[in-house]
């Protein structure tokens, strides 16, 4: 008799999810000497243990603690780049500016980037058919809780000047409901972080507006200032420059240090 399976509103687990996580872990630890000590099988076991056999609407940050422990990584706290709604450009930037790091440049972020996963209560199966949608089903799902957990830890680790890349082409340049707006902003530590500098990336070729005067940026400034962190905002007008450097990664001079 076929077992009844809960139908969720979101896409199911990414195909070949276990193999993908394991392969990414092996690749990452080969490229990053400081993480060579990591046992990727143990990482996968801890990842799996966070959501397998658990109700996918009842996941907690505690479920991910064994994985967090295994994935503990030290990145230079003054070289952190946060982003909101502009992931690809942020990643292009750190691909060139090798001494800056997004969350997805860390082991745990790299493992889960662009993947979906969930299990089922009381079975060891991975659900490849559907997973809970954050809005339509529940917020405490395996993917959302994972990103909330790693994002909080990443923000807590930041120090000195922290940069955030924001999408100037969106109606809400700063969105309180984004991971940046709801998690990272509130977990920057005022005793460690001196300034949050926002880079508002313009899309249009002829765009010469001052998007740092946007009401949502003023809202971000207000939130940050109330947390006793200084705020700075810069208009960035030529994002195509990032791509030009990415196309020629062998050019060591294509970094912001001159």
């Amino acid at each position: 008799v076929p077992r009844w399976r809960q139908q969720w509103s979101g896409p199911g687990t990414t195909k070949r999810f276990p193999e993908t996580v394991l392969a990414r872990c092996v690749k990452y630890t080969e490229i990053h000497p400081e993480m060579r000590h990591v046992d990727c099988q143990s990482v996968w076991d801890a990842f799996k243990g966070a959501f397998i056999s658990k109700h996918p609407c009842n996941i907690t940050e505690e479920d991910y603690q064994p994985l967090m422990k295994l994935g503990t990584q030290t990145v230079p706290c003054n070289k952190i780049l946060l982003w909101s709604r502009i992931k690809d450009l942020a990643h292009q930037f750190t691909q060139v500016q090798r001494d800056m790091f997004t969350l997805e440049d860390t082991l745990l972020g790299y493992l889960a980037d662009d993947l979906t996963w969930c299990g089922e209560f009381n079975t060891s199966k991975i659900n490849y058919q559907s997973c809970p949608d954050w809005r339509k089903d529940c917020s405490n799902n395996p993917v959302s809780v994972f990103w909330k957990t790693v994002s909080r830890r990443f923000a807590e680790a930041a120090c000195d000047v922290v940069h955030v890349m924001l999408n100037g082409s969106r109606s809400k340049i700063f969105d309180k409901n984004s991971t940046f707006g709801s998690v990272e902003v509130h977990n920057l530590q005022p005793e460690k972080v001196q300034t949050l500098e926002a880079w508002v990336i313009h899309g249009g070729r002829e765009d010469s507006r001052d998007l740092c005067q946007d009401p949502t940026i003023k809202e971000l400034e207000s939130i940050i200032s109330k947390r006793n962190i200084q705020f700075s905002c810069k208009n960035i007008y030529r994002p195509d420059k990032f791509l030009q450097c990415v196309k020629n990664p062998e050019d060591s001079s294509c970094t912001s240090e001159i």
């Epitope: 930037f93 060139v96 500016q97 880079w199 313009h202 070729r205 002829e206 765009d207 010469s208 507006r209 001052d210 740092c212 005067q213 700075s232 905002c233 810069k234 208009n235 960035i236 007008y237 030529r238 195509d240 420059k241 990032f242 030009q244 450097c245 196309k247 020629n248 062998e250 050019d251 001079s253 294509c254 970094t255 912001s256 001159i258």
Partner: antibody, heavy 120, light 108 residues
Framework: QVQLVESGGGLVQPGGSLRLSCAAS????????MNWVRQAPGKGLEWVSG????????YYADSVKGRFTISRDNSKNTLYLQMNSLRAEDTAVYYC?????????????WGQGTLVTVSS | DIELTQPPSVSVAPGQTARISCSGD??????VYWYQQKPGQAPVLVIY???KRPSGIPERFSGSNSGNTATLTISGTQAEDEADYYC??????????FGGGTKLTVLR
């Protein structure tokens, strides 16, 4: 090391044309925006034109728009400025300048300049 | 378009601190660059991104940018620092602007 060498300057009559060249070396030319900046005798710096690395995007100061054309040949590592309908006020030393990368839009490296004199 | 305003001249005694200002509407929202130009020579970038110093530029050069004003500071000014100084910013599209320049005189 980065080198920019301008050529093509000289004396030209009002209404005449001139083409400036800038030979670049010491970096991956196609990765960078390139620019022309000028300086009239005894005056300050004035940005004239810029071009993206690929070279799909071109930009011009209002004072030269419609008269000057910037272009580049990435296979030859060379930047050009075609100047038409020249006026006395275009008299200046013309510098070729390489843009800073990524989030910065300033000039990391400059050539030594080539003098353009527009006079009858 | 933003307009950048600099004082035409600044004088300083050797070993003292020189400050050159550059003002423009909401200048803090844009990165500012500073160039040094000596007679008969091409400009040289001394500060980029408000406060970053290119390699080879002495530590006595520093920059800041807040409110409507960016400032180039030269501490322990030396005779060789006598030159014209230009600020510059970029406000999108074809709006790349320089300040009018400041002549720095090191008193003898």
């Amino acid at each position: 090391q980065v080198q920019l060498v301008e050529s093509g300057g000289g004396l030209v009559q009002p209404g005449g044309s001139l083409r400036l060249s800038c030979a670049a070396s010491g970096f991956t030319f196609s990765s960078y925006y390139m620019n022309w900046v000028r300086q009239a005798p005894g005056k300050g710096l004035e940005w004239v034109s810029g071009i993206s690395g690929d070279p799909s995007n071109t930009y011009y100061a209002d004072s030269v728009k419609g008269r000057f054309t910037i272009s580049r040949d990435n296979s030859k590592n060379t930047l050009y400025l075609q100047m038409n309908s020249l006026r006395a006020e275009d008299t200046a030393v013309y510098y070729c300048a390489r843009d800073l990368p990524l989030v910065y839009t300033g000039f990391a490296y400059w050539g030594q300049g080539t003098l353009v004199t527009v006079s009858s | 378009d933003i307009e950048l305003t600099q004082p035409p001249s600044v004088s300083v005694a050797p070993g003292q601190t020189a400050r050159i200002s550059c003002s423009g509407d909401n200048l803090r929202h844009y990165y500012v660059y500073w160039y040094q130009q000596k007679p008969g020579q091409a400009p040289v970038l001394v500060i980029y991104g408000d406060s970053k110093r290119p390699s080879g530029i002495p530590e006595r050069f520093s920059g800041s940018n807040s409110g409507n004003t960016a400032t180039l500071t030269i501490s322990g000014t030396q005779a060789e620092d006598e030159a014209d100084y230009y600020c510059q910013t970029y406000t999108g599209g074809a709006s790349l602007v320089f300040g009018g320049g400041t002549k720095l005189t090191v008193l003898r």
